[in-house]
């Protein structure tokens, strides 16, 4: 019963997910993962926030909205056909079995036309981000499945940015939203 969202190859995909913090700055941990939401966590985690900040993400996955106000919608940059599938947004509300989870289905269509880019911007410069990841001991093994390779410098066209901002506005009302508190 997942909601379906569409994007074309080469575009940025937008998967909406929202919650209303109980009080300003009173954030709830959120994770995004590839695959349907399991009983705990988010399958293969691609991005997560804690009570303060985005504390883990992988290349091409980022939050473009104001997550401090509960907009935890996921943007996937420069999608390929391999990005098709179900994604999990999980709002990790503290307590006994309080998590809210949403399955969103992303359908990637082949690009109709490949426009010649007129101007390029470095997303790392345009959207600087702090990254804090949790360390594992040397004997740890985590299988992350078919996650994309990390490429810290992500390039996208200005046209994509503009299109995505319009798409985000169009989809915002249809996104998964919960109120906390």
């Amino acid at each position: 019963s997942e909601v379906e969202y569409r994007a074309e190859v080469g575009q940025n995909a937008y998967l909406p997910c929202f919650y209303t913090p109980a009080a300003p700055g009173n954030l709830v941990p959120v994770c995004w993962g590839k695959g349907a939401c399991p009983v705990f966590e988010c399958g293969n985690v691609v991005l997560r926030t804690d009570e303060r900040d985005v504390n883990y993400w992988t290349s091409r996955y980022w939050l473009n909205g104001d997550f401090r106000k509960g907009d935890v919608s996921l943007t996937i940059e420069n999608v390929t056909l391999a990005d098709s599938g179900i994604y999990c947004c999980r709002i990790q509300i503290p307590g006994i079995m309080n998590d809210e989870k949403f399955n969103l289905k992303l359908v990637i269509k082949p690009a109709k036309v490949t426009p010649a880019p007129t101007r390029q911007r470095d997303f790392t410069a345009a959207f600087p981000r702090m990254l804090t990841t949790r360390g594992h001991g040397p004997a740890e093994t985590q299988t992350l499945g078919s996650l994309p390779d990390i490429n810290l410098t992500q390039i996208s066209t200005l046209a994509n940015e503009l299109r995505d901002s319009r798409l985000a506005n169009d989809l915002r009302d249809s996104g998964a939203t919960i109120r906390i508190g």
């Epitope: 009983v39 883990y56 503290p94 307590g95 594992h136 985590q142 992350l144």
Partner: antibody, heavy 122, light 107 residues
């Protein structure tokens, strides 16, 4: 080497209480969900409860959540199960198990303790 | 609750045989399925997670397959140490649930 060692089991009368402990070593304890699973004599496996990394979220078998409480102390690398109002049907070997990690991916109880026997009888 | 039904409940086989145990979920659990082996008086041991990924240290004669509601555990050539009980378990819905078990005995 990952090691989980349960303790605290024993004989208790119906209506009594017990607190089980599980000492973890060989991995970064705070990076994993942890679980309790039980097995009645001659029976199959039954999930009891799970707890997230910092203890802020807990998950229970519905029929047990009013009597059992799972908790953890990351500073001590320890997992606990407080069992109250015990019944004869709670008699089982209780296992501590390591569940999914911080980055997801591995959905299965990868490591188990040796188990501790809880016997509820008058 | 998601019910997990294993079949057969018991099975007699000989060393060298190929054995398949099946597990059916009452609802779609995608690939969130694990298989465990348990010997008498011992703790369970993870064999397969995410339906088909072999756990660390598990011999390659074990394999898992399936997704959605139907899953199988296959032992390609039974060894003497494989005679034990086997359980499937889903990690998709709460509560987590196990199959009732399959006891694999020597013929």
């Amino acid at each position: 080497e990952v090691k989980l060692v349960e303790s605290g089991g024993g004989l208790v009368q119906p209506g009594g209480s017990l607190r089980l402990s599980c000492a973890a070593s060989g991995f970064t304890f705070s990076d994993y969900y942890m679980a309790w699973v039980r097995q009645a004599p001659g029976k199959g496996l039954e999930w009891v409860a799970n707890i997230n990394y910092d203890g802020s979220s807990t998950y229970y078998l519905d029929s047990l959540k009013s009597r059992f409480t799972i908790s953890r102390d990351n500073a001590k690398n320890s997992l606990y199960l407080q069992m109250n109002s015990l019944k004869a049907e709670d008699t089982a070997v209780y296992y501590c198990a390591r569940d999914v990690g911080y980055y997801g991916g591995n959905y299965g109880f990868a490591y188990w303790g040796q188990g501790t026997l809880v016997t509820v009888s008058s | 609750d998601i019910q997990m039904t294993q079949s057969p409940s018991s099975l007699s086989a000989s060393v060298g045989d190929r054995v398949t145990i099946t597990c059916r979920a009452s609802d779609n659990i995608y690939s969130y399925l694990a298989w465990y082996q348990q010997k008498p008086g011992k703790s369970p041991q993870l064999l397969v997670y995410n339906a088909k990924t072999l756990a660390e240290g598990v011999p390659s004669r074990f394999s898992g397959s399936g997704s959605g509601t139907d899953f199988t555990l296959t032992i390609s050539s039974l060894q003497p140490e494989d005679f034990a009980s086997y359980y499937c378990q889903q990690h998709y819905g709460s509560p987590l649930t196990f199959g009732q078990g399959t006891k694999l005995e020597i013929k």
